[in-house]
């Protein structure tokens, strides 16, 4: 199935040009999306091209500027946030990135009623996190690992926590491992729906071993970066959840929410918090051995000003075939009765589906079913539930938005997006206004992305928000590669693949093949999305065939495929890439003497193991920032899939699955190893150990390090990286420069 048919007619061929590496590095063909910043059922904010903050009212069709670009520029603001009472705006400047989600910034409060910045009791700097209450204009913020509260922007702050300490105690913000592997946010505090209470997490990292690496900078002596970072089997952060009454915060102070007894009996994690009402909160906990999750619904006891989590309101989710959930344990979406909820988890056939839980998980009512997966619940209203799935036409790499009418019996299901722009749009996400009065659909491909606004009752399209016309025009004279998504059936396993083919692809010719792999648990590479990137260039200009294969361990095709890698990472992911390559060779258009593999992060691990598989299939390959031993990676991620590196658990496979153990097998391949020295995520240690093992085995290889660069290798390093990898591949494939 050709997803991006070439628009090239023979007569036009002369005027068409191939993609260049420069196009990719300059971001010439990047696309835009439009996500409304909803502020009510029918209003949203958007930052205009000239940086004014504009309020749009869908029903009146009117728009007006609430904050001028001049005001934004006066403090060099790069972001903003309107208070729910619309009296104030915070302006964010001096953005300074920390880890994946976290950053610090300076915040200014602008008073919309008098057109002036709030003076007196200004916010300290830099702030680690700041947010408005959901109602009114209270502010909560984190400064130097402590949480502060302001009843109004001009008021003096009330200090909620006092024990915050850098790298030791984190209040209201996650430590490294919770940020990266559990919460996937920069914050760890949550306002109740009407702003009466503020819940927050406290992470105690006192006993966590520290990763230390040099940051070379420009000084005479390098700095040492220290991060409490629990590797597999190491001591983990200790988490506690507190809730404080923000109206009268001083008298009672923060009250700790009790941990369910079955969780507290051994090491555990907190995984998420969901407010149900102002006086009911839902916490999710996870055992360190991540196959048991407990959802606990807690109620405020006014007389004692405490939170009570009765055992009758504990719901256990357990996996007997793998870990709990997908990548994360799913979060509940509560219905209007404030006790029952909708949640995605595995059904009896091993497919992740929406279930309705009213009393116990055992009595859950299954809402969706089939040999496909429900992926996200967007919104539940009185009469509708909106969700995304990959059901349509049985393509796991698609995403469509569905509406189930829950107000009627039996519930009826409607695909909102399946037939809207069928060729162009097969991968959607959505953003809903209050009460789902309106919603935006953002289509990511396979055609050029488009964002549209819709009526929440009728699903009618109201207007196009962004259609990337400039991009469409710019691509008119570009010879884009062809893309196809198909599947291989091998030994009862379905291997979906995406193949990117040169523009003038001829099945009777032979082409060099590059496998791009990620392959991490619960990931998906074969997706019906638009992209003009490095591999597009390699196909368009350099005439390579590029393939992406989703093997065992990947997501959204059922638990059998997903949990196949449980406790044995590095085996089936590699086998399935190799199997796919053999099938591609059988197709007849691959030059089997010119096959390469490359990957980044988990993909670097898989590509390294594939190169060292001893199959003789690969001539060369690249590993960027690879994991080399699971003992070197973060506890939360690693143990989810591998258990513990102890004798009585899974130490043997931890040892067997290292890249270093296969050093000898690199002798007959060309290997390029790349890593940033300031990688806080996959530590440089991983590549250092590979290099050491290769040297000790007297195996030649190529390497490149990027000084002071993290896991993303951003900025000028990106250009250098892709230029370097291009040279390496062209040399490997004997392509002229």
């Amino acid at each position: 199935i050709v997803l991006r048919p070439s628009r090239v007619h023979n007569s036009e061929e002369n005027t068409m040009r191939a993609l260049t590496l420069k196009d990719i590095l300059n971001g010439t063909f990047s696309y835009k999306t439009f996500f409304p910043n909803w502020i009510s059922g029918q209003e949203y904010l958007h930052q205009s091209a000239d940086n004014n903050i504009v309020l749009y009212n869908i029903e009146t069709g009117q728009s007006y500027t609430i904050l001028s670009n001049r005001t934004m520029k006066s403090v060099n603001a790069s972001n903003y946030g309107l208070s729910p009472d619309r009296q104030f705006v915070y302006l964010e400047s001096d953005y300074s990135k920390l880890w994946r989600y976290s950053y610090t910034a300076t915040y200014y409060i602008y008073d919309l009623s008098n057109g002036e910045f709030v003076r007196g009791n200004e916010l300290p700097r830099p702030i680690q996190y700041l947010c408005w209450s959901p109602v009114g204009s209270k502010l909560a913020y984190v400064y130097q690992n402590n949480i502060y509260l302001k009843q109004r922007p001009g008021d003096p702050p009330f200090q909620i926590t006092f024990n915050g300490r850098e790298n030791k105690i984190f209040n209201g913000i996650p430590d490294w491992v919770y940020e990266e592997e559990m919460l996937a946010t920069k914050y760890a505090l949550w306002w109740s729906p009407n702003g009466k209470f503020l819940a927050y997490a406290e992470f105690n990292d006192t006993d966590i071993p520290v990763i230390a690496y040099s940051y070379y900078g420009d000084e005479q002596y390098p700095r040492t970066i220290n991060i409490p970072y629990p590797k597999a089997g190491a001591k983990n952060p200790v988490v506690r959840i507190f809730i404080i009454d923000t109206t009268y915060p001083a008298y009672v102070g923060p009250q700790e929410v009790p941990v369910p007894a079955m969780i507290a009996s051994s090491d555990y994690y907190f995984s998420w918090l969901t407010w149900v009402t102002d006086e009911r909160v839902c916490l999710q906990w996870l055992k360190r051995v991540q196959n048991v999750s407990v959802l606990s619904i807690c109620d405020f006891r006014e007389d004692w000003q405490t939170w009570d989590c009765p055992k009758t309101q504990e719901h256990i989710e357990e996996s007997r075939t793998g870990w709990a959930g997908g990548f994360f344990v799913s979060t509940p979406v509560f219905s209007y009765d404030a006790i029952s909820y909708y949640k995605i988890f595995s059904d009896k056939d091993g497919y992740k589906h929406i279930h309705y839980i009213k009393d116990t998980v055992e009595n859950a009512i299954q809402i969706t079913s089939g040999k496909w997966e429900a992926i996200n619940i967007f919104r539940v209203t009185q009469d509708s539930l909106f969700y995304s799935s990959n059901e349509f036409e049985e393509y796991p790499g698609r995403r469509n938005i569905y509406r189930i009418s829950i107000g009627s019996y039996p519930p009826s299901k409607k695909c909102v997006t399946c037939h809207l722009r069928k060729e162009r749009c097969q991968y959607y996400t959505a953003s809903f206004s209050d009460y789902a009065k309106y919603y935006a659909l953002v289509c990511y491909g396979p055609g050029i992305p488009i964002s549209t606004l819709h009526d929440g009752r009728t699903d009618q399209e109201i207007k196009i928000l962004e259609e990337n016309k400039e991009l469409e025009n710019a691509l008119k004279n570009i010879q884009l590669p062809k893309e196809e998504i198909k599947k291989l059936e091998v030994d009862e396993i379905t291997l979906w693949y995406k193949m990117i083919l040169p523009p003038q692809f001829d099945r009777s010719k032979k082409y060099p093949l590059l496998i791009q792999v990620y392959g991490g648990p619960c990931s998906q590479s074969v997706r019906s999305v638009f992209a003009v990137n490095w591999i597009s260039y390699l196909a368009s200009k350099e005439g390579m065939v590029i393939a992406l294969v989703d093997g065992r361990g990947t997501a959204f095709q059922g638990d059998k495929l997903l949990y196949a890698v449980y406790r044995k990472l590095g085996v089936y992911e590699v086998e399935d890439q190799i199997t796919a390559v053999r099938k591609f060779i059988e197709m007849g258009f691959i030059d089997e003497k010119r096959i390469a593999i490359w990957g980044w992060s988990y993909g670097g691990y898989v590509s390294s193991l594939a190169l060292a598989s001893g199959t003789g299939l690969f001539k060369c390959g690249i590993a960027v920032a690879p994991v080399s031993s699971w003992e070197y990676y973060a506890s939360v991620y690693t143990e989810r899939f591998m258990g513990l590196p102890t004798k009585d658990d899974n130490l043997e496979h931890y040892k067997n699955s290292t890249v270093m153990a296969r050093a000898e097998y690199f002798r007959n391949v060309d290997y390029l190893l790349i890593h940033g020295t300031a990688d806080d995520n996959v530590h440089f240690q991983n590549s250092a150990q590979i290099a050491k093992a290769l040297v000790n085995a007297q195996v030649d290889f190529q390497a490149m390090w990027y000084s002071d660069q993290n896991h993303g290798l951003s900025g000028l390093s990106t250009n250098h990286l892709y230029t370097h990898m291009t040279h390496f591949l062209k040399q490997c494939f004997s392509l002229s420069d």
Partner: antibody, heavy 122, light 107 residues
């Protein structure tokens, strides 16, 4: 120097309502730093917290007494009051009013009245 | 409710002795513990707040320590005016609760 002074009848009949007032002098009751509380001590026994009030009227009560207790504040008179209904002999105690500092946390009672003995008897 | 248990209930000591009174909370109260001294017929008097902070005007022979569930009041050198009953009190939650008291008597 801050002073607190309890006043009210020293004898109350069973089933009736005990009413006490605490007058604050040498400082304002309308401060965001303090709550104003009532604590009692039965003869020869330990201390029991009854409840506390903020100048705005926000109250916290001991759950064991909550159904019978009302604490109110009158900022214009710079005093606060305690009402305890349906009293029995078990409510016989010395009743203290006290100032509870709440900022910086935690709360602690730094100024106390001298106490007034209330006897419940027919 | 958080129960506060003091030990001992009473003790006899001489002037100049070092006296230690312990207070245990039924659940963690962080550092939110206060100590009071009460003499017969008088209102309690604040000695220590926040587990270890000495109230202004209180002699430095009084000190407090602890956090979580276990706390200690220490009188480094007992003076004649220190013979009294001592109460601990938690302010971590509602209801505010006091220990049952420790009576310090002359040996």
């Amino acid at each position: 120097q801050l002073q607190l002074q309890e006043s009210g009848p020293g004898l109350v009949k069973p089933s009736e309502t005990l009413s006490l007032t605490c007058t604050v002098s040498g400082g304002s009751i309308s401060s965001s730093t303090y709550y104003w509380g009532w604590i009692r001590q039965p003869p020869g026994k330990g201390l029991e917290w009854i409840g506390s009030i903020f100048y705005s009227g926000n109250t916290y009560y001991n759950p064991s007494l909550k159904s019978r207790v009302t604490i109110s504040v009158d900022t214009s008179k710079n005093h606060f009051s305690l009402k305890l209904s349906s009293v029995t002999a078990a409510d016989t105690a010395v009743y203290y009013c006290a100032r509870e500092i709440i900022e910086p946390r935690p709360g602690y009672f730094d100024y106390w009245g001298q106490g007034t003995l209330v006897t419940v008897s027919s | 409710d958080i129960q506060m248990t003091q030990s001992p209930s009473s003790l006899s000591a001489s002037v100049g002795d070092r006296v230690t009174i312990t207070c245990r909370a039924s659940q963690s109260i962080s550092k939110y513990l206060n100590w009071y001294q009460q003499k017969p017929g008088k209102a309690p008097k604040l000695l220590i707040y926040a587990a270890s902070s000495l109230q202004s005007g209180v002699p430095s022979r009084f000190s407090g320590s602890g956090s979580g569930t276990d706390f200690t009041l220490t009188i480094s050198s007992l003076q004649p005016e220190d013979f009294a009953t001592y109460y601990c009190q938690q302010s971590n939650s509602i209801p505010r609760t006091f220990g049952q008291g420790t009576k310090v008597e002359i040996k």
